[in-house]
């Protein structure tokens, strides 16, 4: 029950996180005009990953897309890439985790398979969350650097009579949405990984199992080959119950390590 709850909660938290990552990626307010010196401005600038906008105090808002690809800063391209990778991994993770949910029955899917899928989706959520956090952090770092550079320029270029006001940008709402969403996706992924451990049945190792058949008894070790009984190579453990041989497969395979970019 606790495992199902942990898995379900992990799924829901990741779902909210990924929705947040998508929202942050689409939002226009990644950077907003710094209003420290002028809290009430007649022209307010803000920028996203895909377009920049200007909101006038008249209420008129105009947004322009970044129609160039080569002319954009490499850092912005990197942030875009990180966010998209985060969304893609998250979406795949969600798809996998739906089938992995213990409360959903799909055919005769074994618990071991569900455990594998839960672990896979958990890892995907963790990487997705990390991508989002990394993307937002890179952008934030870029903003901080530019902010202090423009501040320095502001105070060095005041010699003339005519002032040219340089627009400084600070953290926009999208950054906070991205950080929180990335964190939630990460937490959801960890929860899925924890749930995976509970889903995976304990592997019981039997050194020798007695197989009772009418007439004669044969002792064999799992994985052994017995031509006379007509069995092929048996790589599975057999549990022996009173009164006859009932088999219950217990396979637990561990996924190989993959590098997610």
């Amino acid at each position: 029950m606790a495992v199902t709850a942990c898995q379900g909660l992990g799924f829901v938290v990741s779902l909210i996180g990924i929705a947040g990552i998508i929202a942050a990626t689409c939002m226009d307010q990644w950077s907003t005009q710094d209003l420290y010196n002028n809290p009430v401005t007649a022209v307010f600038n803000y920028q996203g990953l895909w377009r920049s906008c200007v909101r006038e105090s008249s209420g008129f808002t105009e947004c322009r897309g970044y129609f160039t690809l080569l002319g954009l800063p490499a850092m912005l391209q990197a942030v875009r890439a990180l966010m998209i990778v985060g969304i893609v991994l998250g979406a795949i993770g969600l798809l996998v985790s739906i089938f992995a949910l213990k409360c959903i029955r799909i055919g005769s899917m074994e618990d071991s398979a569900k455990a594998n899928m839960t672990l896979t989706s958990g890892i995907m959520f963790i990487v997705s969350g990390l991508c989002a956090i990394a993307g937002v952090s890179v952008f934030a770092n870029m903003l901080v650097t530019n902010f202090w550079m423009s501040t320095a320029n502001m105070y060095t270029g005041m010699g003339g009579m005519v002032q040219t006001v340089q627009t400084r940008y600070t953290f926009g709402a999208a950054l906070f949405v991205g950080w929180v969403a990335g964190g939630l996706t990460l937490i959801g992924g960890v929860m899925m990984c924890i749930a995976c451990r509970g889903l995976a049945p304990e592997e019981t190792n039997y050194k020798a199992v007695s197989y009772h058949a009418s007439g004669h008894s044969v002792a064999y070790k799992p994985g052994g080959f017995k031509a006379s009984t007509g069995f092929g190579s048996n790589t599975k453990n057999k549990k022996i119950y009173d009164g006859g041989a009932r088999t219950e497969d217990e396979v637990q395979s561990y996924p190989s390590k993959h590098d997610y970019v």
């Epitope: 007649a42 920049s52 105090s57 209420g59 005519v162 002032q163 627009t167």
Partner: antibody
Framework: EIQLQQSGAELVKPGASVKISCKAP????????MNWVKQSHGKSLEWIGN????????SYNQKFKGKATLTVDRSSSTAYMQLNSLTSEDSAVYYC???????????WGHGTLVTVSA | DIVMTQSPSSLTVTVGEKVTMTCKSS????????????LTWYQQKPGQSPKLLIY???TRESGVPERFTGRGSGTDFTLTISSVQAEDLAVYYC?????????FGSGTNLEIK
């Protein structure tokens, strides 16, 4: 075309207050911020302030803070400006004007002449 | 506050003549976000309310004749009337739309000979 209908001329005594109105029928009143502009006789224009027709939030020219109070009544699509503690310096034509792209004022009322005289 | 300085304060021209008036601002009116200059030109005929001619320094308001042209960027702006007509007799004001409080120039009075 948007017509901004302003109230008639006012003759008031020094120290008194006056409230002038600006009705904006025929268009979505709440889509625009309403601005008020002062023009003293034979002089230039001075921006007093503006009010968001939907939220009622205001921005004032520091010079007119305490002198002018801007309000709106959405139900009647009317903006109001109250001028307090009037002096002869406040004698002028007051215009209401809406706000559009470029923070420009495309439509103006015909103006309300306020004369402060004992 | 941004100070708007207009020149000349008055000018007299004949019908058909080309006329140019200037407006200087104490601060740049160019917004880096959209590369637009927040300067507006108005025409006020005697006994009338002001009328919007040009916004964003060079964008003509609908219904405004093509003879009116706005130019300039940053702090220096001009309004040109390519061929003055008798009905252009008015005072022309420039306005800062970039920062609060919005400020107007003292006006250029255009008179017809």
């Amino acid at each position: 075309e948007i017509q901004l209908q302003q109230s008639g001329a006012e003759l008031v005594k020094p120290g008194a207050s006056v409230k002038i109105s600006c009705k904006a029928p025929g268009y979505s009143f709440t889509d625009y911020n309403m601005n008020w502009v002062k023009q003293s006789h034979g002089k230039s224009l001075e921006w007093i302030g503006n009010i968001n027709s939907y939220y009622g939030s205001t921005s004032y020219n520091q010079k007119f803070k305490g002198k002018a109070t801007l309000t709106v009544d959405r139900s009647s699509s009317t903006a109001y400006m109250q001028l307090n503690s009037l002096t002869s310096e406040d004698s002028a034509v007051y215009y209401c004007t809406n706000f559009d792209r470029g923070n420009s004022f495309p439509y103006w009322g015909h103006g309300t002449l306020v004369t402060v005289s004992a | 506050d941004i100070v708007m300085t207009q020149s000349p304060s008055s000018l007299t021209v004949t019908v058909g003549e080309k006329v140019t008036m200037t407006c200087k601002s104490s601060q740049s009116l160019l917004n880096s976000g959209n590369q637009k200059n927040y300067l507006t030109w108005y025409q006020q005929k005697p006994g009338q309310s002001p009328k919007l001619l040009i916004y964003w320094a060079s964008t003509r308001e609908s219904g405004v004749p093509e003879r009116f042209t706005g130019r300039g960027s940053g702090t220096d702006f001009t309004l040109t009337i390519s061929s003055v007509q008798a009905e252009d007799l008015a005072v022309y004001y420039c306005q800062n739309g970039y920062s609060y409080p919005f400020t107007f120039g003292s006006g250029t009075n255009l008179e017809i000979k």
